[in-house]
């Protein structure tokens, strides 16, 4: 699987999950989240050659098409597969609230 | 929706489904499919700015991150959303077989 266990410990050039730290204020302009100040969101990056963790029959077709037509702009793209929630603290008035923001952290990628 | 109805009739620059015809022999090297000789597979292409048909909370975060950090390589990608099957005819010996190949045609796209 193109997950953090594999991707963070390798020098994989193809589609893989990469490390990305996002600071809520600096990178998003969000001041409403009190904690955490930022988080390891990660992101997906890398080419999607034929047979590399392809998502659907269409992805396989498109990767093969791209192999036969190297100059084409049609190619599969490396995108998130497994996402995890992030617990946050924000304030309603003076009262702190804890909430889980769903689908915030990328754990693995796929070629779609 | 970023579907064929909207995208094929507009000059949309952002993520949208684009026309792509794939010839099984020429583009994939497949000789086993007897009919059709090719099909309109389509593909997804275009930038994914903030709020443009974003798939998950993570996609929104990444698009906003990209807006604040324009030079970053982390950005959402335009990928298939709705896929449709393609009926094909192939031969087993001298006997023609009809089969539906699932997830072969892109009908709409999303930013993931």
């Amino acid at each position: 699987a193109l997950d953090t266990n594999y991707c963070f410990s390798s020098t994989e050039k193809n589609c893989c999950v990469r490390q990305l730290y996002i600071d809520f204020r600096k990178d998003l302009g969000w001041k409403w989240i009190h904690e955490p100040k930022g988080y390891h969101a990660n992101f997906c990056l890398g080419p999607c050659p034929y047979i590399w963790s392809l998502d659907t029959q269409y992805s396989k077709v498109l990767a093969l098409y791209n192999q036969h037509n190297p100059g084409a702009s049609a190619a599969p793209c490396c995108v998130p597969q497994a996402l995890e929630p992030l617990p946050i603290v924000y304030y309603v008035g003076r009262k702190p609230k804890v909430e889980q923001l769903s689908n915030m952290i990328v754990r693995s990628c796929k070629c779609s | 929706a970023l579907d064929t109805n909207y995208c094929f009739s507009s000059t949309e620059k952002n993520c949208c489904v684009r026309q792509l015809y794939i010839d099984f022999r020429k583009d994939l090297g497949w000789k086993w499919i007897h009919e059709p000789k090719g099909y309109h597979a389509n593909f997804c292409l275009g930038p994914c700015p903030y709020i443009w048909s974003l798939d998950t909370q993570y996609s929104k975060v990444l698009a906003l991150y990209n807006q604040h950090n324009p030079g970053a390589s982390a950005a959402p990608c335009c990928v298939p959303q709705a896929l449709e099957p393609l009926p094909i005819v192939y031969y087993v010996g001298r006997k023609p077989k009809v089969e539906q190949l699932s997830n072969m045609i892109v009908r709409s796209c999303k930013c993931s």
Partner: antibody, heavy 117, light 107 residues
């Protein structure tokens, strides 16, 4: 590399005020929270508060509200902490520390404050 | 405010031994916890952040674990340079309180 250089030791009289500085270098000062921490001789660490230099936002430990005032000067990449109405209880070492990734990853060398008549 | 209860307060051990220091939070802090080492007269040094991640340059004999309200710092095969004081600190809503500290002494 990241460095936090604090001002020198201070000897002040009870009732007076003092302003401690922390000059940052090696990172984007404006976009990282700066924390301040107190340590009395032979004791543990106490979190005083934090400031976001980019817009001057602050969060204080309730215990230090009215005692400590945090400010920052973006042009010189310097954070300040003013302590007022000093008593012997304020005699301590004060640290500035950069907030990053759910921790304080870089600390200043500490400023010793002695309050004595 | 979230309280951090650190134990033991002091520990007398020999070089080569393994020690575990624990920190209990008064409520769930979702792994937003750091561990520091402080030598006499020096600034604290970050060892572990986000409960389990080793800070740059920290030897692999140090490890952090835990979740929810219970966290621990383990030091395998103690070296002479490991003696000093250790503190945990939560980062789950201000004030970011510290544990009371653990003084690690040579036996």
């Amino acid at each position: 590399q990241v460095q936090l250089q604090q001002s020198g030791a201070e000897l002040v009289k009870p009732g007076a005020s003092v302003k401690i500085s922390c000059k940052a270098s090696g990172y984007a000062f404006s976009s990282s929270w700066m924390n301040w921490v107190k340590q009395r001789p032979g004791k543990g660490l106490e979190w005083i508060g934090q400031i976001y230099p980019g817009d001057g936002d602050t969060n204080y430990n309730g215990k230090f509200k009215g005692k400590a005032t945090l400010t920052a000067d973006k042009s010189s990449s310097t954070a300040y902490m003013q302590l007022s109405s000093l008593t012997s209880e304020d005699s301590a070492v004060y640290f500035c520390a950069r907030h990053y990734d759910g921790s304080t990853d870089y600390w200043g060398q500490g400023t010793t404050l002695t309050v004595s008549s | 405010d979230i309280q951090m209860t650190q134990s033991p307060a002091s520990l007398s051990v020999s070089v080569g031994e393994t020690v575990t220091i624990t920190c209990r939070a008064s409520e769930n802090i979702y792994s937003n916890l750091a561990w520091y080492q402080q030598k006499q007269g020096k600034s604290p040094q970050l060892l572990v952040y986000a409960a389990t991640n080793l800070a740059d340059g920290v030897p692999s004999r140090f490890s952090g674990s835990g979740s929810g309200t219970q966290y621990s710092l383990k030091i395998n095969s103690l070296q002479s340079e490991d003696f000093g004081s250790y503190y945990c600190q939560h980062f789950w809503g201000t004030p970011y309180t510290f544990g009371g500290g653990t003084k690690l002494e040579i036996k």
